[in-house]
């Protein structure tokens, strides 16, 4: 049975050119973390694997960075950054574990950060 | 142009061990990671287990964890791999196979090497 | 481990049919799917990835769709070098794993 929880850093907003840190934490369950995947659109940004670390996506290397922890850092922000991302924990033996993050990206300077909330 | 030479066929009795060997050329090797891939007579496939030729870190698939081992030589090109306390049923040929990404560990294997035949006989 | 499974395990066809290949996997692997071509004796040799790109060198009858958990590989008229057994594998989420095989067979 799946016990565990996911929280994350919710609905948040950063100013266009800035950078945000999007951030999961896994909790309530002693499941052991195999591989963390980050997607946004299906696709893959990076994965933190186990037993071969960090690992960010061609495709994504100059705009991403890893961390802190399991979270993970985009960088020179624009407005077509605005969407869904997704923190997949990758677990044994639960399974897989899915959090959601909202980022919308601003012109303006008034980027305000949403509050924690929890994804059963 | 990209070759992964492999070592040659090997016969062993139950309980040896055995060491594949395969040479890379023709781009950077520690740019791109590894993977062991074995297949059975008349069988399909089987992921055995990845290695960073750049720092040396490896993941090995569940069923190979203590018996496998990866391991890499930056000075002449070649990752190895060891396979310990062999069984009739590891009978096999193993292939070498790079990813295709860079420094991306989940790409696809795009170029393999010609694979080495492993028999476990007594 | 995401398991990957492969229909028919086998066929017969004729050179010139449209030959189509299925892999479904136990979850969402996104667009994370490589299919492969091996011939007896030879180490296989990367058709598709990520689901519809065609690898270099690979000819344009050889097309991949699908994303989520179902995934599809047409040859669109077979010749007679297609004869040889194709493996779906997933690429998203490390161990990467592969399908049972489809053997394509002559008629």
């Known amino acids: 049975m799946m016990t565990g929880t996911i929280e994350t850093t919710g609905n948040i907003s950063a100013e266009k050119g800035g950078s945000i840190i999007l951030q999961c934490h896994l909790s309530s369950t002693t499941a052991q973390v195999t591989q963390v995947n980050w997607e946004q659109q299906d696709q893959l940004l990076a994965i933190c694997n186990a037993d071969l670390g960090w690992h960010i996506s061609p495709s994504f290397k100059d705009r991403v960075a890893p961390g802190p922890g399991l979270g993970l850092t985009l960088q020179s922000l624009t407005v077509n950054d605005t969407g869904e991302y997704f923190c997949i924990y990758h677990t044994y033996p639960d399974g897989t574990y899915t959090g959601r993050i909202f980022l919308e990206v601003l012109e303006s300077s008034v980027a305000e950060h949403g509050a924690r909330f929890q994804i059963p | 142009q990209v070759q992964l030479v492999q070592s040659g066929a090997e016969v062993k009795k139950p309980g040896a061990s055995v060491k594949v060997s395969c040479k890379a050329s023709?781009?950077?090797?520690?740019?791109?990671?590894m993977h062991w891939v074995r297949q059975a007579p008349g069988q399909g496939l089987e992921w055995m287990g990845i290695?960073?030729?750049?720092?040396?870190?490896?993941s090995y698939a569940q069923m190979f964890q203590g018996r496998v081992t990866m391991t890499r030589d930056t000075s002449t090109s070649t990752v190895y791999m060891e396979l310990s306390s062999l069984r009739s049923e590891d009978t096999a040929v193993y292939y070498c196979?790079?990813?295709?990404?860079?420094?991306?560990?989940?790409?696809?294997?795009?170029?393999w090497g010609q694979g080495t035949l492993v028999t476990v006989s007594s | 481990d995401i398991q990957m499974t492969q229909s028919p395990s086998s066929l017969s066809a004729s050179v010139g049919d449209r030959v189509t290949i299925t892999c479904r996997a136990s979850?969402?692997?996104?667009?994370?799917l490589n299919w492969y071509q091996q011939k007896p004796g030879k180490a296989p040799k990367l058709l598709i990835y990520?689901?519809?790109n065609l690898q270099s060198g690979v000819p344009s009858r050889f097309s991949g769709s699908g994303s989520g958990t179902d995934f599809t590989l047409t040859i669109s008229s077979l010749q007679p070098e297609d004869f040889a057994t194709y493996y779906c594998?997933?690429?998203?989420?490390?161990?990467?794993?592969f399908g049972q095989g489809t053997k394509v067979e002559i008629r």
């Open positions: 594998q997933q690429s998203y989420i490390i161990p990467p794993t």
């Open positions: 196979a790079r990813d295709r990404e860079e420094q991306w560990p989940v790409g696809g294997f795009d170029y």
């Open positions: 990520s689901a519809s």
């Open positions: 979850q969402s692997i996104r667009r994370y």
């Open positions: 290695i960073n030729p750049s720092g040396g870190r490896t």
């Open positions: 023709g781009y950077t090797f520690t740019s791109y990671y």
